[in-house]
């Protein structure tokens, strides 16, 4: 569904913007912020994961990286998979801008996207079957 | 290429319709590298509330429920895009901002042996 949420109030003394729209500058603040050097936690974790890059030229940013847990269980001290524990994905919402082509016109839509960031090892919830 | 400034529909489309947020709500407690969630609120930002994870322990929880310092709890960080009101306080004029958030924690084999 395209049902979204509106989180704005009526403008008072701000730049005029057409009704039902907002002005968005996509020059990113903190674009060059210092990110820590690669820590390789995805391969050192007891719930290791791999990365897949998704590419969409009509999305900004075009590149979104998704993690996938490598195992169902967790890796024990011996380097073996322990299926008494579960590797589970940790997810985070982010915003992207979607470009939509409708005939000769182009419109832009903000979207919330759920990104899988990595995995963690959890004790399983036991589902007792009646 | 995207233009530097765009006019965007006020409705934010949620592509996460098939996800159940409750599904992962207790991972922070069940993880071998458990974390606490701290509320970060900023009315000049959308979303105005972001939950920041802080690992509960330096080590990881072992099968006996004790902290094992042979393993390390480490935050999993992610850069996300948010909207920053620009100029400040304006309800419908924004700029994208990249922020680094800790989403949860994972247990890793150490590469740094601080303790002999």
């Amino acid at each position: 569904g395209s049902e979204g949420e509106t989180f704005f109030q009526k403008p008072e003394s701000c730049p005029p913007v057409p009704g039902g729209s907002m002005k968005l500058d996509i020059g990113i603040i903190n674009e060059n912020q210092r990110v820590s050097m690669s820590r390789n936690i995805e391969s050192r974790s007891t719930s290791p994961w791999d990365y897949t890059v998704t590419w969409d030229p009509n999305r900004y940013p075009s590149e979104v990286v998704q993690a996938q847990c490598r195992n169902l269980g967790c890796i024990n001290a011996q380097g073996k998979e322990d299926i008494s524990m579960n590797s589970v994905p940790i997810q985070q919402e982010t915003l992207v801008v979607r470009r939509k082509h409708q005939g000769s016109s182009v419109s832009f839509q903000l979207e919330k996207v759920l990104v899988t960031v990595g995995c963690t090892c959890v004790t399983p919830v036991i589902h007792h079957v009646q | 290429n995207f233009p530097r400034t765009v006019m965007v529909n006020l409705n934010i489309h949620n592509r996460n319709t098939n996800t159940n947020p409750k599904r992962s709500s207790d991972y922070y407690d069940r993880s071998t590298s458990p974390w606490n969630l701290h509320r970060n609120e900023d009315p000049e930002r959308y979303p105005s509330v972001i939950w920041e994870a802080k690992c509960r322990h330096l080590g990881c929880i072992n099968a006996d429920g004790n902290v094992d310092y042979h393993m390390n709890s480490v935050p999993i960080q992610q850069e996300i895009l948010v909207l920053r009101r620009e100029p400040p306080h304006c309800p419908n004029s924004f700029r994208l901002e990249k922020i680094l958030v800790s989403v949860g924690c994972t247990c890793v084999t150490p590469i740094v042996h601080h303790v002999a």
């Epitope: 936690i41 | 802080k54 509960r56 330096l58 310092y69 390390n72 480490v74 590469i111 601080h114």
Partner: nanobody, 123 residues
Framework: QVQLVESGGGLVQPGGSLRLSCAVS????????MGWFRRPPGKEREFVAA????????KYADFVTDRFTISRDDAKSTVYLQMNSLKPEDTAVYYC????????????????WGQGTQVTVSS
Amino acid sequence: QVQLVESGGGLVQPGGSLRLSCAVSGRTFSSYAMGWFRRPPGKEREFVAAISWSGGDTKYADFVTDRFTISRDDAKSTVYLQMNSLKPEDTAVYYCNDMPYGLDTRMDEYEYWGQGTQVTVSS
């Protein structure tokens, strides 16, 4: 700009005590973990102690052997190191820093250190 201001060092006799303080400003104090490090004369900087954000979890280097206690006061954005039963080999410049990756934080990841506080243990 981040600032780490260590204080409380000095000259003390073997067996004596000192309490070091580190005031943190310019960033959120309640980082995942905070740590104390030291650089003995002519040696590399080494880890001394760490404390989790909640203060409920602490870890010490083996040479500490129950002589030191790390604590933190979030209201004052300060981390402390209580040092008892000091030995001549504890002579060093002591530094504090946050440990954003806890015990996994590498020395080479730090882009900023404070000036440190000199601790000299001598009779």
